[in-house]
């Protein structure tokens, strides 16, 4: 083993791994053929000048998660092999011009979730074949212009969970083979016009988490070959008409978690291969017609958590693939019977905390493929003869949480549940909310005899009784239904191990999230 | 006649937590949504929480997300609310409220007479 | 969704006609409450729905107002009627009230 430190492991003689608190400097000697290195959870504070000297045959070095705050300029000489550096879980506030001179084979250098407070152009000047730089995690509050000219080779740069307040548009100008940008959890609040123009080869750029509240035109023209834009979580409250429009390898798009109050039609566009489309939680309050008309191969799109009061009949026109349509908690009363016309292809829909007070009958007409429908916390008292007939494949349909009136016209609904029973699930059943002597009896087995004949009443109030709010105390309690809850809170998959917690109801569709870079 | 009657509240400090309770009489508990409304000392009224009639759907306000959880039993016509991680300015008079309808409304046709929550050191 | 009363208080005497309004900073369409309360009670409901009278409540109460100006007028103030008045809206989550209006009697 040409002489393994006793602190250490050489499972083979080129791989050494030196771990524990007992460590505080480099062990010594080390193998000198030893071609991958780890220096792991040890209480080393400072690498001196070349203390890899004798292992000029490294090809990976890894210095994790130690107390190192100081790095002398000639630790890593000699390394001439080296291609894969990782400084990454330290205390490194400062790196020394000229740490990384004499690597001329470094195509990794990892230098996140450390303290740095700045870099500058000379300390990656000599890196001229890196590939990947990872700078997330440490505390850079701007990018000197020039910092990474020297780095045409780069393909990968993480910046995120920074304090960058602003980019320069001049800093990525030389970056032509980079695909991956990473800009995430900073504190940025806009980003100039031309910053990405010469990223020609991007194919992610992560912005999500930031502050940002305007996006300029033509900010991603230059990048055609963009397969994932992650802008979620800014105070984006407006789209420029543009802004989607050269970005046809798009494939994923989120926009959750802004300001969004409107969609102006062919905004998404065209885009042949996205398939999930991410709005939930912004301030959106109408859809037009034809706004998603453009992306004729989305599969999921999440409206949710919005302040959506009307939809008009042809906004889903060409979304002819969609499977997945999350409407919920928004505040509809009303949808016109053709809107959801186009959706050949939906299996599950999701309408329920809304203020829906009916349904029109041919509602579901054409999504004869319906697998689940989630109607609970509305405000329905009654359903259209027929409405759920043709929908063979429907296997869940949640009811609940509405006020049902349980007078004659009730009737041919609750002989539909009785027969299908089944696809109500069996922890949470609709019960009648009026008349009040049959208030909380099941709507499935309540004796039709007991409710009073039908009374038509005005629309407002909904609730028709002597008065919407009658005192009930001369009413003895009946039926009570035991409390389930049907939220759940998945969490979303970030590329780079950042993680968001959202509430979308998603569980009940059994799919996965990873939304954001 | 309806009553609500809360219950649960005290002094706690910062970073502590407190349930409240909420015993409903005299409606059929299971078919009205119910919400919690506190309110400061000399300020407004501050809504918190709702929860539907089966307990399927909940909602809070921005400031309690993570900490507050609603929830209900309607076998024993019960609303609580599980405070953790406590705040001065969680410190408030918490009223329990009864909903108009099933559904999650904003419209309370009967409130408790509130039990007092204090965060402090 | 931030509610805004006005006036923050007013003064007036037995049988004046009273006027409180609450503005929206977003259309809620009319999806609002009014809420009465007087010192060391709980609140009361006195309309919903922007312009529907809760059951009880007298009919000297009445809304209007759609999107994003509401009024609550008492047509002829009572003595019982001296307290401090919310609107409410539950529009969109989370729910919020305005900031209050207290009615005084006037000396």
């Known amino acids: 083993y040409y002489g393994c430190p006793s602190e250490c492991t050489c499972s083979r003689a080129s791989q050494v791994e030196c771990t524990g608190a007992r460590i505080v400097a480099v062990p010594t000697p080390l193998p000198w053929n030893a071609m991958s290195l780890q220096i792991l959870n040890t209480h080393i504070t400072e690498l001196s000048e070349s203390p890899f000297l004798n292992i000029s045959a490294l090809i990976a070095l890894r210095i994790e998660k130690n107390e190192l705050s100081h790095i002398m300029p000639g630790a890593f000489r000699n390394l001439g092999s080296l291609r894969y550096l990782s400084l990454a879980n330290n205390k490194l506030q400062v790196l020394p011009i000229g740490l990384f001179q004499g690597l001329d084979s470094l195509e990794s250098l990892l230098l996140s979730s450390n303290q740095l407070v700045q870099i500058q152009p000379a300390h990656f000047s000599q890196c001229s074949n890196l590939k990947e730089l990872q700078l997330h995690g440490n505390h850079l509050e701007y990018i000197p212009d020039g910092a990474f000219d020297h780095l045409v080779g780069l393909t990968k740069l993480n910046l995120g969970k920074n304090s960058l307040t602003h980019i320069s548009p001049r800093v990525f100008q030389h970056l032509g083979n980079l695909q991956v940008l990473r800009l995430y959890e900073n504190r940025l609040t806009d980003i100039p016009m031309g910053t990405f123009d010469g990223l020609v080869n991007l194919q992610e750029l992560a912005l999500q988490q930031n502050q940002i509240g305007l996006l300029s035109p033509g900010l991603f023209h230059n990048n055609h070959n963009l397969q994932r834009l992650y802008l979620s979580n800014n105070h984006i409250s407006q789209l420029p008409p543009s802004i989607f429009m050269q970005l046809p390898q798009l494939n994923r798009l989120t926009l959750f978690g802004n300001s969004l109050k409107e969609l102006s039609p062919g905004i998404f566009g065209p885009m042949p291969n996205l398939r999930e489309l991410w709005l939930y939680d912004n301030h959106i309050t109408s859809l037009p017609d034809n706004v998603f008309s453009n992306l004729r191969q989305l599969q999921v799109l999440i409206l949710s958590r919005n302040q959506i009061s009307f939809i008009s009949p042809g906004a889903f026109n060409g979304l002819t693939e969609l499977r997945e349509l999350s409407l919920h908690t928004n505040a509809l009363q009303d949808l016109d019977g053709n809107v959801f016309r186009m959706l050949a292809n939906l299996q599950n829909i999701s309408l329920q905390n809304n203020r829906l007070r009916q349904l029109p009958g041919n509602i579901f007409a054409n999504v004869n493929g319906l697998m689940t429908i989630q109607l609970q916390n509305n405000q329905l008292e009654n359903l259209p003869l027929g409405i759920f007939d043709h929908l063979g494949k429907l296997c869940e349909l949640r009811l609940y949480d509405n006020p049902w009136r349980c007078d004659s016209d009730i009737l041919p609904l609750r002989n539909w549940l009785l027969l299908n029973q089944p696809r109500l699930g069996t922890d949470t059943v609709p019960v009648c909310f009026s008349p009040a002597n049959v208030r909380g009896q099941s709507l499935i087995i309540i004796n039709v005899n007991v409710a009073v004949p039908s009374v038509h009443v005005p629309e407002v109030p909904s609730y028709p009784e002597t008065s919407w709010y009658p005192d009930t105390s001369s009413y003895p309690d009946t039926t009570s239904i035991s409390s389930t809850t049907e939220l759940t809170s998945p969490v979303e998959d970030y590329t780079d191990l950042t993680t968001i917690q959202v509430t979308d109801d998603r569980s009940v569709w059994g799919m996965t999230q990873a939304q954001s870079g | 006649q309806v009553q609500l009657l809360e219950s649960g509240g005290g002094l706690v400090q910062p970073g502590g937590s407190l349930r409240l309770s909420c015993a409903a009489s005299?409606?059929?508990?299971?078919?009205?949504?119910m919400s919690w409304v506190r309110q400061a000392p000399g300020k407004g009224l501050d809504w918190v929480s709702v929860i539907s009639g089966t307990g399927g759907s909940t909602f809070y306000t921005d400031s309690v997300k993570g900490r507050f959880t609603i929830s209900r039993d309607n076998s024993e016509n019960t609303l609580y609310l599980e405070m953790n991680s406590l705040r001065a300015e969680d410190t408030a008079v918490y009223f329990c409220?009864?909903?108009?309808?099933?559904?999650?409304?904003?419209?309370?046709?009967?409130w408790g007479q509130g039990t007092l929550v204090t965060v402090s050191s | 969704i931030v509610l805004t009363q006005s006036p923050s208080s007013l003064s007036a005497s037995v049988g004046d006609r009273v006027t409180i309004t609450c503005r929206t900073s977003?259309?809620?369409?009319?999806?609002l409450g009014w809420y009465q309360q007087k010192p060391g009670k709980a609140p009361k409901l006195l309309i919903y729905d922007a312009s529907s009278l809760q059951s009880g409540v007298p009919s000297r109460f009445s809304g209007s107002g759609s999107g994003t100006d509401f009024t609550l007028t008492i047509s002829s103030l009572q003595p019982e009627d001296f307290a401090t008045y919310y609107c409410l809206q539950d529009n969109n989550y989370p729910w919020t009230f305005g900031q209050g209006t207290k009615v005084a009697i006037k000396r």
């Open positions: 409220a009864k909903a108009v309808t099933v559904n999650t409304r904003g419209f309370f046709d009967y």
């Open positions: 005299g409606f059929t508990f299971s078919t009205f949504a």
């Open positions: 977003q259309v809620i369409r009319n999806d």
